[in-house]
Interface confidence: medium
Amino acid sequence: EICGPGIDIRNDYQQLKRLENCTVIEGYLHILLISKAEDYRSYRFPKLTVITEYLLLFRVAGLESLGDLFPNLTVIRGWKLFYNYALVIFEMTNLKDIGLYNLRNITRGAIRIEKNADLCYLSTVDWSLILDAVSNNYIVGNKPPKECGDLCPGTMEEKPMCEKTTINNEYNYRCWTTNRCQKMCPSTCGKRACTENNECCHPECLGSCSAPDNDTACVACRHYYYAGVCVPACPPNTYRFEGWRCVDRDFCANILSAESSDSEGFVIHDGECMQECPSGFIRNGSQSMYCIPCEGPCPKVCEEEKKTKTIDSVTSAQMLQGCTIFKGNLLINIRRGNNIASELENFMGLIEVVTGYVKIRHSHALVSLSFLKNLRLILGEEQLEGNYSFYVLDNQNLQQLWDWDHRNLTIKAGKMYFAFNPKLCVSEIYRMEEVTGTKGRQSKGDINTRNNGERASCESDVLHFTSTTTSKNRIIITWHRYRPPDYRDLISFTVYYKEAPFKNVTEYDGQDACGSNSWNMVDVDLPPNKDVEPGILLHGLKPWTQYAVYVKAVTLTMVENDHIRGAKSEILYIRTNASVPSIPLDVLSASNSSSQLIVKWNPPSLPNGNLSYYIVRWQRQPQDGYLYRHNYCSKDKIPIRKYADGTIDIEEVTENPKTEVCGGEKGPCCACPKTEAEKQAEKEEAEYRKVFENFLHNSIFVPRPE
């Protein structure tokens, strides 16, 4: 039986009975928040072989192993993930081992096993046999390995039953529990699965099979399942569904949406049966099962019941996400906020049309209006008193309206009003008059030339770069020395730089008045010698990366005809030199015959240039006889199992401090103090843990039904 669309078992362990007849869970499986320790021995679900999404276990008291519950769980497909993970085991207080001894494949996603105070047999599982890449796995805060004394079957009797693999240069036996080995297929099978008797399965099988080389005997399918057969692609007139099986049109038409009774039914798009048209597509009929592309972003009209929508926080802006036409008036009043410019762009950046007026007042957090990056029409159907449809009042840090070289904005009806915007140059306002077609509509007092731009460098001269030199992680630039009318008014220069993959950045991108700024800033003092051109060495840059750079002169607030003079450069785009790439990731090797090795890897995370080829080197190594002489009984006495507290053992997260030879004598030194990079990595690690935990809690704690 296929169960779904996701099973959530919480509070009462007897709900597990819902899994009784499931062979495949089409969706996720949550088992969580069972606070009373129960005896799970009577619960066993041998039919369950596949979970198409993810498995999440959280705070289930009394459960000591998953092996008895799910003895035949073979594949977790990870079609949809829980925060990038296909298997999450979190805060399972009594879990002693995972024990999923038939788990052979996690098709997509990583694993997260964290804060399980009594959990052992983690170092004995070779996850690389189950997952394609193990680099994203997160296994921390469990019982420290040295307190576990994990023994694989037969090792105490010197008759080891399990096979060995190498993990982190440690060649050891692989098992799930004290009596269950980790299954490995013969190298002759390559990437194929195998039967219990080590015969190779059909290439379309995944995980395991009941008979060799037979596409109807698979436990799970590598690609798709259709009419009892594993197939590489869905046959004609059938459609991919939930990432694992093929269904016909009638099946797709008959699915009731689990998520919304308002759904108009599933659609067929690009060979797949799905709940809704994907982003950028729209149904071609209310009864239609087919999608057609939208022209541009799919239009969405949003309307405010009270006619005027006040944007005074990110939360209020969030209501406008995806809107392309706003029916009503926008009142923007952003006094403070964190990373406000990019948040506003995220939520309001698709708005193209406002049917009423736009009013921006007391928005001291705004430096630019570029977050309304698609606004092209203000209809002015409703206007403020005085017939204003664009009104900008008292915004202490507003410096730019839009980048008028790349912006067409029309104000169909109504006038503009600007007052008390001390950093907004009048020339910027005049430019807006021309672009928007409002020139001639405003009366004299509508654009105040005394209190707009009174604290800005409005009459800007252009600074010219004179030289640029690059290396793999440095850029040296110099520019002409700026000479204002009175040399004493020049204080210093500020260099702004940031990564810019495309040549489309503006000075105000991601910038707000509350400290958020996507630009890095460096102050440059004036060279003491008046004939030396100012310059700077930017270091710590990434190789083979394009940067945008511009320079501003910092001048005294010297008033000349009501305004301050200043200077800045155009934005310069410059790429650092290529460098040696970082190491290739996830290197795997397997032998498929007595004379061949297959080596597979993923590209480096930092190519640092255009990769043109890889160099593969290999050498023959003598067999290590020690491996055969190793005797488990000669190990140090296995430590008594102390109950761990589930907090994270620093040793697990960071490697043990290395002892080094000091001076001429052999003796251990103290561990070196942590570098800034290590401290930063630890900080990020802690932050990442918090983010995940918040995500987990937000996802699973829901209000009780009424």
Epitope: A253, N254, L256, S261, D262, S263, E264, G265, I282, R283, N284, G285, S286, Q287, I292, C294, E295, C298, P299, K300, V301, C302, E303, E305, I325, K327
Partner: antibody
Amino acid sequence: QIQLQQPGAELVKPGASVKLSCKAPGYTFTSYWMHWVRQAPGQGLEWMGETNPSNSVTNYAQKFQGRVTLTVDTSTSTAYMELSSLRSEDTAVYYCTIGRGRGFAYWGQGTLVTVSS
Amino acid sequence: DIQMNQSPSSLSASLGDTITITCRASQNINFWLSWYQQKPGKAPKLLIYKASNLHTGVPSRFSGSGSGTDFTLTISSLQPEDFATYYCLQGQSYPYTFGGGTKLEIK
């Protein structure tokens, strides 16, 4: 509250055309298909066609194909239905209505079109 | 076109009664059936959509069931405001088609 506003009545001559409006404030106009249904005096309900305000895709009942045209103006959240070559049997109340789960959730109050010379 | 056969065409009942109206489709329409109530001179009102989902604001004495070709609307404990004409509508394939209607009258 979603409400669809339609004019009360239209009197037209046979052979002429009529263009009915349906103003749709109070909801995201482009999020729902707009349908047109008519009801002749003392008769049942008859579906004429639908349009998607977000991309102007239309689907018509075969019976009205060629005679009916559905359009929208998203800036004013108004849908229009134009019926041409009118005959006396087109005398009916014409409703605009928006969809929900392939049903018609909200209805205008209807426009009575009388075709008479 | 899919034909919708609604029965009975008229029905008399008393306050507090439970009544059932049926709608039969000429072919499988899955669960794409909705029910409407119309009073004289007024626009129809949606009661049930997708065969069994109660529309917002509709009293719980209205219920719908069925799938495939046979569907029923049940009104339990009839109230004075329930006396009206009821229509079913199929949304499985174009064109949308209505049943002929059932006029519910007070006995």
